[in-house]
Interface confidence: medium
């Protein structure tokens, strides 16, 4: 296996007071049997609210690299291929669970963490505020 | 905390052979500090590719309830509020990590699992296949 420099403050896995700690088998099971999880999705280019993917790296987290969607335009692409600013491109966000080494550098002690990621963009009608 | 009927076949958390098992602290830390993940996002109604949210519940999974997006139309909503079938509403899908009790009903033994969820919908230009 891997040799990881061990933090002397790593919790004792048998410590009954280690808060809300459970055993997790990390042989990740894939339930995506009926679908194709790695389908070739080019929606980010074909969408009327296209997006680019930006890299976010954190070596203490699994997955270590998260690619985040950033909408390319404030507006949406119209039928002529131009940006229509009467509509808005907005990110669709979703919370995902990640594992974080805690304390850092402990080889098999983790904390579950929720982070919000932008998955893609959608085109919405703007909310117009009329000034009296 | 919650009392879960214990399966007598639950693995021994001290078993050194319990495969790829780590200690995970389930006091979930929320990193979404700069954003408001519980903001009232009405994008699902305002999008040109609107969607409905369907509840998927599984008591043996964490999180137990996952809301899945289903696109309302095959086409997209145009400026007149009608469905334009020259464009396609498609789901934006994302893999998420969840925890599944394994074996079932064991209070503190889980397996990490990947599932594919639809987060929202976006409007894309269709791929047109020209027949020779």
């Amino acid at each position: 296996g891997i040799t990881i420099p061990r933090n002397p403050g790593c919790p004792n896995s048998e410590d009954k007071n280690f808060p809300r700690t459970v055993m997790v088998n990390l042989n990740i099971h894939n339930r995506n049997t009926n679908t194709n999880p790695k389908r070739s999705s080019d929606y980010y280019n074909r969408s009327t609210s296209p997006w680019n993917l930006h890299r976010n790296e954190d070596p203490e987290r699994y997955p270590s690299v998260i690619w985040e969607a950033k909408c390319r335009h404030l507006g949406c692409i119209n039928a002529d291929g131009n940006v229509d600013y009467h509509m808005n491109s907005v990110p669709i966000q979703q919370e995902i669970l990640v594992l974080r080494r805690e304390p850092p550098h402990c080889p098999n002690s983790f904390r579950l963490e929720k982070i919000l990621v932008s998955v893609g963009c959608t085109c919405v009608t703007p909310i117009v505020h009329h000034v009296a | 905390g919650i009392t879960i009927p214990r399966n007598p076949g639950c693995p021994n958390s001290e078993d050194k052979n319990f495969p790829r098992t780590v200690m995970v602290n389930l006091n979930i830390h929320n990193r979404n500090t700069n954003t408001n993940p519980k903001r009232s996002s009405d994008y699902y109604n305002r999008s040109t590719s609107p969607w409905n949210l369907h509840r998927n519940e599984d008591p043996e999974r964490y999180p137990s309830v996952i809301w899945e997006a289903k696109c309302r139309h095959l086409g997209c909503i145009n400026a007149d509020g009608n469905v334009d079938y020259h464009m396609n509403s498609v789901p934006i899908q994302q893999e998420i990590l969840v925890l599944r009790r394994e074996p079932p009903h064991c209070p503190n033994s889980f397996r990490l699992e990947k599932i594919l969820v639809s987060v929202g919908c976006t409007c894309v230009t269709p791929i047109v296949h020209h027949v020779a």
Partner: antibody, heavy 126, light 107 residues
Framework: EVQLVQSGAEVKKPGESLKVSCKAS????????ISWVRQAPGQGLEWMGG????????DYAQKFQGRVTITADESTTTAYMELSGLTSDDTAVYYC???????????????????WGQGTTVTVSS | EIVLTQSPDFQSVTPKEKVTITCRAS??????LHWYQQKPDQSPKLLIK???HSASGVPSRFSGSGSGTDFTLTINSLEAEDAATYYC?????????FGQGTKVDIK
């Protein structure tokens, strides 16, 4: 850009063991895995096994199970592949390859080889 | 294990011509199919990941398509530097496997 530099060519006798190193630089070691792939002379590519650096998991192809050991040392950012009980069939070029550990385009992308070492030529002959 | 069968085994092509290489999987693998290029005496290089996504720095003349069991690598307007052996690789199930390779040379 991650660079993988492998140890030099080796000549071994049947029955001996082999240990090839793969030194990674230019990226954070924990954020990817390392797989080992070999190529016999004039033949195609064959996956032997790999290690996920973040967890220290290893996976091996059944064909090599019990004969191959893959390890990694985070402090030196080096992965190792040890193969025992060598025969002439093990004569090949051995490559290490980087496996990303990414959440990409909505998916956990952790299973292709985006960067390769230069290869280590191993000859097994009596 | 999942067997990948490439065709053709060998292709001799003139520059500017279009090259199509197919890879068939013995079972459904979604889009967990990747393509590599290996030039003589060099290490393999990733071209396409997940059936259709180009790796960074790969010229736009290379493209991939397909899902399920049938996949295609296309080189539009072949250049002399594209002479190499091309391998498909599946990562849907362990052990990871490769196709037998398709050698492309320039006429």
């Amino acid at each position: 850009e991650v660079q993988l530099v492998q140890s030099g060519a080796e000549v071994k006798k049947p029955g001996e063991s082999l240990k090839v190193s793969c030194k990674a630089s230019g990226g954070r070691f924990r954020t990817y895995g390392i797989s080992w792939v070999r190529q016999a002379p004039g033949q195609g590519l064959e996956w032997m096994g790999g290690i996920t650096n973040f967890f220290g998991w290893t996976d091996y192809a059944q064909k090599f199970q019990g004969r191959v050991t893959i390890t990694a040392d985070e402090s030196t950012t080096t992965a190792y592949m040890e193969l025992s009980g060598l025969t002439s069939d093990d004569t090949a070029v051995y490559y290490c390859a980087r496996v990303p550990n990414e959440f990409w385009n909505g998916y956990y992308a952790t299973d292709y080889f985006d960067n390769w070492g230069q290869g280590t030529t191993v000859t097994v002959s009596s | 294990e999942i067997v990948l069968t490439q065709s053709p085994d060998f292709q001799s092509v003139t520059p500017k011509e279009k090259v199509t290489i197919t890879c068939r999987a013995s079972q459904e693998i979604g889009a967990s199919l990747h393509w590599y290029q290996q030039k003589p005496d060099q290490s393999p290089k990733l071209l396409i990941k997940y059936a259709s996504h180009s790796a960074s720095g790969v010229p736009s003349r290379f493209s991939g398509s397909g899902s399920g069991t049938d996949f295609t690598l296309t080189i539009n307007s072949l250049e002399a530097e594209d002479a190499a052996t091309y391998y498909c690789h599946q990562s849907d199930g362990l052990p990871y496997t490769f196709g037998q390779g398709t050698k492309v040379d320039i006429k």
